[in-house]
């Protein structure tokens, strides 16, 4: 029997200082550019090498960004989200959701990766 794939979802507050080339990551998503089915949220699609986000080390590709400086990113057009990031100032506070894939053993068997163990 095949194991099932579960996800461990965690949230984190990440404070970045804008670098010489900005925040150092790319985003996808928005109400007009859904990245995940039935989800118009904003996601990190790329971390720029040696950019602000990479040097901080906590933000990961695939993370969902829930808010910027306390401002919710729900139901935003893609460009509106981009503008919000670009105008967020020098010190930027991000509320992010990490989604870690956890491979469990077969049903009825608690595998090593099972977070409930």
């Amino acid at each position: 029997m095949n194991g099932r794939v579960d996800y461990l979802v965690t949230e984190e507050e990440i404070n970045l200082t804008r670098g010489p080339s900005g925040l150092g990551f790319n985003i996808v998503g928005g109400t007009d550019q859904q990245y995940v089915s039935n989800d118009s949220g904003i996601y990190v699609s790329r971390i720029k090498e040696n950019g602000a986000a990479a040097l901080d080390g906590r933000l990961q590709e695939g993370d969902k960004i829930l808010s910027v400086n306390g401002q919710d990113l729900k139901n935003l057009l893609h460009q509106d989200a981009v503008d919000l990031f670009r105008n967020a100032g020098y010190a930027v506070s991000l509320r992010v959701q990490h989604r870690l894939q956890v491979q469990n053993g077969p049903i009825g068997h608690r595998g090593e990766g099972d977070p409930s163990g």
């Epitope: 150092g24 990551f25 996808v28 699609s45 790329r46 720029k48 090498e49 602000a52 893609h78």
Partner: nanobody
Amino acid sequence: DVQLVESGGGLVQAGDSLRLSCAASGITFRWYTMAWFRQAPGKERDFVATINWSGSDTNYADSVKGRFTISRDNAKNTVTLQMNSLQPEDTAVYYCAGVPGTSLSGETDPRDYDYWGQGTQVTVSS
């Protein structure tokens, strides 16, 4: 496998026009920022133009503003570069490049792009 394939290069006279095309496969094209770069012999790879995911936002190098136009067709997974009033200094290998999402750090540095085509030669004779 991601593939970017350029076409449309060639040898033209100064003042002529060329239209370069880049066909993308293996990516969800509509999520990608696309760009054109060029590299003359013995020179660095230089930014030419970039276009956002929807085609609503474009950016050009000063040297090509008013002469070159970048556009995209998300239904056909293609990005084009219309080049008018070509000059001998436009001679170079032209590369199509792509990166997922919209950059919050910059889009004119070759290091900002993950995927590249093999290039197409454009030669402008005087």
